[in-house]
């Protein structure tokens, strides 16, 4: 008599996750009598996933009625594949008994599930860099399968080739992650850049996923100061303005200082945006010429999100007609409190 | 190639715990057993445990209650730990893996890891 | 559990002469699919165990055909054709067929 054979066909099976597999198994002979079993793995620690005699197996049908006589077929249909179900899996059959010996196993059926990777989260950097300097980008993804993955990123749209991925486990393992870091340097232009992030793998298609982070959210561009005076219809007063331009973002707080004592603070409300996503701001004082005696230096300090302090000093220039101007009464003492008026446009 | 390496203090006070890691490289922990085997010195090989990379986990039975075998996939690493050590628990550590085809036995423990020495003492 | 029994426990040999270890288990080995689930280790001074032989009878990747295992069910044999002098060290057999995992004593093989 010919000794009793088990076949599983497929040295391998893949499936997408949430589908159904079919892991084919026959045996040469109805003799001796015995059941079927099917593990996943080998050894002790393997995992019984379907016995016909007993047992709840909700996801695992046979193709065929084992229960009929001459039944060669002992295929088994596993339903809605999850990464976890991925192993190698073996048909045995054992020989009645009590307990059943086991007699004969099929040279197993590994079964690889294919999984989506997840969206890809990018995250920037905790703090705000200025341009010229280099930040870095971090992409993931989780929960893909089979381990071969693609990861692209680009700036504005153009690819990017300074970064450094790593997809984990090294090993063969049910599912992988991936995580990208890509270093950028900025410059002045970038508020309105963004960076993506792009995962291809077999399971999209051919229709990459993206993650995308703004460098709005990692630059800061700091301001450029310019202090000028222009004379006032009224002959004992000139305008004293204070350009900041060029910044971002909008977190600014100005401060006028008259001979290095602080005159007037003011945090920047009304802003004026370039194209290039970045703000201008002005800030003026009216000056009553009349009030001050030459050496009067008006100082434009501004700190900028936070940052150190930067400034712009302008000596006060005060013509001999306006001098002429001024009565004896108008003119008060050198050090009188006198505040200038201010605004800001 | 497949290598295992051991890592853990080389020195554990009495009644302390002893912990060892084994990192796994140039291969996977999947479809294997990952086993931990002592030598006290100048004696034989004593197998302490292993575990599945299913998370299924078998002990020597005399250390059952001391030891716990787990499994990092993610770091491709597995440890040791026996609390309550004595004397008696000095020997070389070694990490190894175990092949397992099918069938309910297994096929040759394959790589082994170059041996930690563990020494307790005060 | 299965108790390992390895004879003799001190071989002293001369290069190029064959050898062999006997090792005995105190239940069979041979599991009713017919595999036999006994292996052959090779512990260099120094070193970790390397495994020789697995199932009984099937060599290891990598090593010489010097060396062969056979027998079945409870007593198995470890055969070196021609004896070379990096075999020496201890020879350890092992039972995998069911857990605990045991060992022989070990066989110490030394140069004469």
């Known amino acids: 008599e010919e000794e009793l054979q088990v076949i599983q066909p497929e040295k391998s099976v893949s499936v997408t996750a949430g589908e159904s597999a079919t892991l084919n198994c026959t045996v040469t002979s109805l003799i001796p009598v015995g059941p079927i079993q099917w593990f996943r793995g080998a050894g002790p620690g393997r995992e019984l996933i379907y016995n016909l005699k007993e047992g709840h197996f909700p996801r695992v049908t046979t193709v065929l009625d084992p229960t009929k006589r001459n039944n060669m077929d002992f295929s088994i249909h596993i339903s809605n594949i999850t990464p976890a179900d991925a192993g190698t899996y073996y048909c045995v059959k054992f020989r009645k008994g009590s307990p059943d010996v086991e007699l004969k196993s099929g040279a197993g059926t590994e079964l690889s599930v294919r999984a989506k990777p997840s969206a890809p989260v990018v995250s920037g950097p905790t703090a705000r860099a200025t341009p010229e300097h280099t930040v870095s980008f971090t992409c993931e993804s989780h929960g893909f399968s089979p381990r071969d993955i693609t990861l692209k990123w680009f700036k504005n749209g153009n690819e990017l080739s300074d970064f450094q991925t790593n997809v984990d486990p090294a090993g063969k393992s049910v599912s992988y992650s991936i995580r990208s870091t890509a270093r950028v340097v900025l410059t002045r232009r970038d508020v309105h850049s963004q960076v993506i992030c792009e995962v291809a793998h077999v399971t999209l298609q051919g229709d990459p996923l993206r993650g995308t982070a703004n460098l709005s959210e990692a630059i800061r561009v700091p301001p450029t100061l310019e202090v000028f005076q222009r004379p006032m219809r009224a002959e004992n007063q000139v305008n004293v303005t204070c350009q900041v331009r060029k910044f971002y973002p909008q977190r600014l707080l100005l401060t006028w200082l008259e001979n290095g004592n602080v005159s007037q603070t003011e945090t920047a409300s009304t802003l004026t945006e370039n194209k290039d996503g970045t703000y201008n701001w002005r800030s003026w004082l009216l000056v009553n010429t009349c009030a001050h005696r030459d050496g009067v230096v008006l100082t434009c300090q501004v700190e900028h999100d936070g940052q150190p302090a930067v400034s712009k000093s302008h000596a006060l220039e005060v013509s001999a007609h306006q001098k002429e101007q001024c009565s004896d009464t108008t003119s008060g003492p050198v050090l009188a409190p006198t505040a200038p008026l201010g605004g800001s446009g | 190639q497949v290598q295992l390496q051991e890592s853990g203090p080389g020195l554990v006070k009495p009644s302390e715990t002893l912990s060892l890691t084994c990192t796994v490289s140039g291969g996977s922990i999947r479809d294997y057993y990952w086993s931990w085997i002592r030598q006290p010195p100048g004696k034989g090989l004593e197998w302490i445990g292993f575990?599945?990379?299913?998370?299924?986990?078998f002990y020597q039975s005399s250390l059952k209650s001391r030891v716990t075998i787990s499994l990092d996939t993610s770091k491709n690493q597995f440890s040791l730990k026996m609390t309550s050590v004595t004397a008696a628990d000095t020997a070389v550590y070694y990490c190894a893996r175990v092949r397992a085809y099918s069938g309910i036995g297994l096929d040759g423990t394959d790589v082994w890891g170059q041996g930690t020495t563990v020494t307790v003492s005060s | 559990d299965i108790v390992m029994t390895q004879s003799p426990l001190s071989l002293p040999v001369t290069p190029g002469e064959p050898a062999s270890i006997s090792c005995r288990s105190s239940?069979?080995?041979?599991?009713?699919?017919?595999?036999?689930?006994l292996d052959w280790y090779l512990q260099r001074p120094g070193q970790s165990p390397q495994l020789l032989i697995y199932g009984g009878s099937s060599r290891a990747s990598g090593v010489p055909d010097r060396f062969s295992g056979s027998g079945s069910g409870t007593d198995f044999t470890l055969k070196i054709s021609r004896v070379e002098a990096e075999d020496v060290g201890v020879f350890y057999c092992g039972q995998a067929l069911q857990t605990p995992l045991t060992f022989g004593q070990g066989t110490k093989v030394e140069i004469k």
């Open positions: 575990i599945y990379y299913n998370g299924r986990t």
């Open positions: 239940q069979s080995l041979l599991y009713s699919t017919g595999y036999t689930y």
